[in-house]
Interface confidence: medium
């Protein structure tokens, strides 16, 4: 009724003084490899000389934190997070950040990064668009109230209004150049 | 200024659900997270959940089979809603909103005293 | 979870004289980008809670100099150095280093 081997585990590793043997009714707890977290119960048990129970160890990294516009990054970048790990931002001048000045990983998702609104209620430049470009030339700041002009290359269809507008800083939702369905 | 207005039930019996919506002024909700704090009768603080600026939430592993949090930008509403209430859930519940710095919470609303009885 | 232990519970003080809040964390609060997310609370009677210091000494917007917060690693205090009238209530400290955010079980603050 005894145990042999330890049963493996994808990314989770065994507790404990490693033993040839284990008694009926014995427990081994596992531990996730860093950038794991346990998903359910931690142990196996030993019962009739097979052990039942299953550690499950999921990934909750995070990889790429996100793109803040008119900010850049001032904590160390990694290729990879683990859960808890913070990515602190700031804002370029004359921005101003709104919002937590961090984002964290959490189980695999970033929390929500801030903003960084010209406090002036100007815009920086319009936001580029997928196989479509501005009609004028782009400058690094527009009054507000001010608007350009997205036209798509060639074969491309626009989708949504083709002029944006700055509001409070902002620039209102820019229209998709999609390519046509062919027949 | 900042303001976060809280309205809810003050009494629910046991097994209920309780319901709370925490209006915001002053801030957007697209800008700033909130979370949910409360606080048993002559005790501390006690961390539940927040929701992040972007809609996903987060939640104190204690609560999470019980504990939703949601909102809607556009009203400037968030809702809580935690189920199957018990006696021990008696209390002051509030919500806050996340600060800039390292995720305080700066702002808080003027709380809902909810007893659980029968 | 983190455990946030205060000392002590209850903190009698004479106006204009300096008090001293503890605070004991059960894991270092020391993330891995360096810096300490420890803050610190006031709770005045009848009122929700308001944010005085944030990342250990940092102070929050409209918060009197008198209040400095200190620690490193484990061991935190918040300090006031002439203690008024409108300083009395229950003092929190709060860690939002690891998930779940905690928060000590609260230092009363009152006249002697």
């Known amino acids: 009724t005894d145990c042999l081997s330890l049963p493996s585990f994808e990314n989770a590793i065994p507790m404990g003084e490693k033993k040839d043997v284990y008694k009926a009714g014995e427990q081994v707890t596992y531990t996730c490899a860093t950038y794991y977290k346990m998903d359910g119960a931690s142990n196996v048990t030993c019962i009739n000389s097979r052990w039942t129970g299953r550690p499950t160890c999921r990934d909750t990294s995070c990889v790429n934190p996100p793109t803040v516009q008119n900010a850049y990054i001032v904590s160390r970048q990694m290729s990879k997070y683990p859960s808890g790990e913070r990515v602190r931002y700031q804002c370029r001048s004359p921005y101003e950040m709104f919002g937590d000045e961090e984002v964290m990983c959490l189980n695999g998702n970033w929390t929500e990064p801030p903003q960084c609104k010209d406090s002036t209620g100007k815009c920086g430049p319009p936001p580029p668009i997928d196989n479509g470009d501005i009609t004028s030339f782009p400058l690094s700041v527009y009054a507000p109230a001010s608007s350009v002009e997205y036209q798509c290359q060639n074969l491309y269809q626009l989708e949504g209004n083709k002029r944006i507008t700055c509001r409070n800083g902002q620039w209102s939702e820019p229209p998709k150049c999609l390519h046509p369905c062919v027949i | 200024q900042v303001q976060l207005k809280q309205s809810g039930p003050g009494l629910v019996q046991p097994s209920q659900s309780l319901s709370i919506t925490c209006t915001v002024s002053g801030f957007s909700l697209t800008n700033y997270g909130v979370h949910w704090v409360r606080q048993p009768p002559g005790k501390g603080l006690e961390w539940l959940g927040v929701i992040w600026s972007g809609g996903n939430t987060d939640y104190n592993a204690a609560f999470i089979s019980r504990l939703s949090i949601s909102k809607d930008n556009s009203k400037s509403q968030v809702f809580f809603k935690m189920n199957s209430l018990q006696a021990d859930d008696t209390a002051i519940y509030y919500c806050?909103?996340?600060?800039?710095?390292?995720?305080?919470?700066?702002?808080w609303g003027q709380g809902t005293s909810v007893t659980v009885s029968s | 979870d983190v455990v946030m232990t205060q000392t002590p519970l209850s903190l009698p003080v004479s106006l204009g004289d300096q008090a001293s809040i503890s605070c004991r964390s059960s894991?270092?609060?020391?993330?891995?980008?360096?810096?300490?997310?420890l803050h610190w609370y006031l709770q005045k009677p009848g009122q929700s809670p308001k944010l005085l210091i944030y990342k250990l000494s940092n102070r929050f917007s409209g918060v009197p100099d008198r209040f400095s917060g200190s620690g490193s690693g484990t061991d935190f205090t918040l300090k006031i150095s002439r203690v008024e009238a409108e300083d009395l209530g229950v003092y929190f400290c709060?860690?939002?280093?690891?998930?779940?955010?905690?928060f000590g079980s609260g230092t009363k603050l009152e006249i002697k």
């Open positions: 806050a909103k996340n600060g800039d710095y390292g995720y305080t919470m700066d702002y």
């Open positions: 894991q270092s609060l020391v993330h891995s980008n360096g810096n300490t997310y």
């Open positions: 709060s860690q939002s280093t690891h998930v779940p955010f905690t």
